[in-house]
């Protein structure tokens, strides 16, 4: 059994999250993860989920009673999701820490927008991609 | 030329982001994207980048002078990044909108943690994954 299981059970007690009523009104993450089988789609979703958990853990960083549990879970998340790669984790953390209200950050983001967009679709690296006809607004 | 290019140039003017000084102190996104060649790694990073842009655009949703540009860019982002799949975009948006300070959301997140963790590593779907020996401390 992976170390995170015992520690996650400990967090369930702390957050009073073991009761059946917690599942009322559907799931947060599990239903969404069920929708996506392709690895690249799953990473898009998991990236948001992992950043949510890191934010949540950050909010409870001063609570000593759950520190060991949080540390163990973060360790296992880093092993599993970032494949134990510190650079990957560091780059991810940089992205999650940019402030959307910082004027310099805004200017930089807009300055880089064209190049970011050019790299967004998987086929961007290998040649001109047929523009999908599917209709999207907003 | 993709439609977003002209509209991104328009945003550059609006944000005063065309000047060379904007590039001082390195890039926000481009340097990070350069580090990651594997599609699944790129999706982890791009997921955070795209959510940043959507948040940024949301902050300027009442500014009529850039509405057309923002809409065009968002549409093109949806085509490129979400492959014109509304369900993918909707699931992504749900994840970005969860509030980390909402007590019910916190309880649900902790309730689902064990199952989320079990699915984090790519091999999780196809059988028991050898626990990486690389060293991480949470």
């Amino acid at each position: 059994q992976d170390p995170y299981v015992k520690e996650a059970e400990n967090l369930k007690k702390y957050f009073n999250a073991g009761h059946s009523d917690v599942a009322d009104n559907g799931t947060l993450f599990l239903g969404i993860l069920k929708n996506w089988k392709e690895e690249s789609d799953r990473k898009i979703m998991q990236s948001q989920i992992v950043s949510f958990y890191f934010k949540l853990f950050k909010n409870f960083k001063d609570d000593q009673s759950i520190q060991k549990s949080v540390e163990t879970i973060k360790e296992d998340m880093n092993v599993k999701f970032f494949n134990s790669n510190k650079k990957k984790r560091d780059d991810f953390e940089k992205l999650t820490n940019y402030s959307v209200t910082d004027l310099n950050v805004q200017r930089k983001a807009i300055h880089e927008l064209i190049q970011v967009m050019a790299e967004l679709s998987p086929a961007a690296k290998t040649g001109k991609r047929k523009r999908s006809q599917m209709l999207f607004r907003g | 030329q993709d439609p977003y290019v002209k509209e991104a140039e328009n945003l550059k003017k609006y944000f005063n982001a065309g000047h060379s000084d904007v590039a001082d102190n390195g890039t926000l996104f481009l340097g990070i994207l350069k580090n990651w060649k594997e599609e699944s790694d790129r999706k982890i990073m791009q997921s955070q980048i795209v959510s940043f842009y959507f948040k940024l655009f949301k902050n300027f949703k009442d500014d009529q002078s850039i509405q057309k540009s923002v809409e065009t860019i968002k549409e093109d982002m949806n085509v490129k990044f979400f492959n014109s799949n509304k369900k993918k975009r909707d699931d992504f948006e749900k994840l970005t909108n969860y509030s980390v300070t909402d007590l019910n959301v916190q309880r649900k997140a902790i309730h689902e943690l064990i199952q989320v963790m079990a699915e984090l590593s790519p091999a999780a779907k196809t059988g028991k994954r050898k626990r990486s020996q690389m060293l991480f401390r949470g």
Epitope: N78, S84, N85, K87 | N35, S132, M134, L135, R137
Partner: antibody
Framework: EVQLLESGGGLVQPGGSLRLSCAAS????????MSWVRQAPGKGLEWVSA????????YYADSVKGRFTISRDNSKNTLYLQMNSLRAEDTAVYYC????????????????WGRGTMVTVSS | NFMLTQPHSVSESPGKTVTISCTRS????????VQWYQQRPGSSPTTVIS?????PSGVPDRFSGSVDSSSNSASLTISGLRTEDEADYYC?????????FGGGTKLTVL
Amino acid sequence: EVQLLESGGGLVQPGGSLRLSCAASGFTFSSYAMSWVRQAPGKGLEWVSAISGSGGSTYYADSVKGRFTISRDNSKNTLYLQMNSLRAEDTAVYYCAKDHSSGWYVISGMDVWGRGTMVTVSS
Amino acid sequence: NFMLTQPHSVSESPGKTVTISCTRSSGSIASNYVQWYQQRPGSSPTTVISEDNQRPSGVPDRFSGSVDSSSNSASLTISGLRTEDEADYYCQSNDSDNVVFGGGTKLTVL
């Protein structure tokens, strides 16, 4: 001042065993992953093994897998390397090294090295 | 497992600039941090660059590190060479379950 002091090296016959120790001081030992790196006479550096701050995760170079065991005692601020089934090609100076990042980070680099202890495997 | 390849030796005169390369055989050089270690004769290694381009305290700014994705290599550059820079230099990186050192480069200050 951060210090690492290795001990336990010596002359051993092929097939024999040795246990190396590394006494650490000057930093919060349990917060850092630690590694063993070796250097054969006149050769380059070769990573041998590493262990997480808690001791819960360990990993090894292919050349020593199944023969060497890394461990640590955080209450004694000491790192160990148990070496069994020693071979002539294990002859080297063995360095103990501290990871440069505290916390949960990967072993991505070492920032402090001990002075090393010599292990000679010969009949 | 990947390999890191360094030139066996380089030499340059005092005051000049020298660059030591470190090429990764497989996998992207940019996808894991690169470290550089200096080892003077008869001494233990010391870190001169960590995490691609970070200088630990006490390391002079004459030492700099960089990573180039296009050549899949990292470089250590030492400017204003001094006689005390004469040493072996090792690059090091890792993947998810392996730490790898380059073969080392002997720097001679003429």
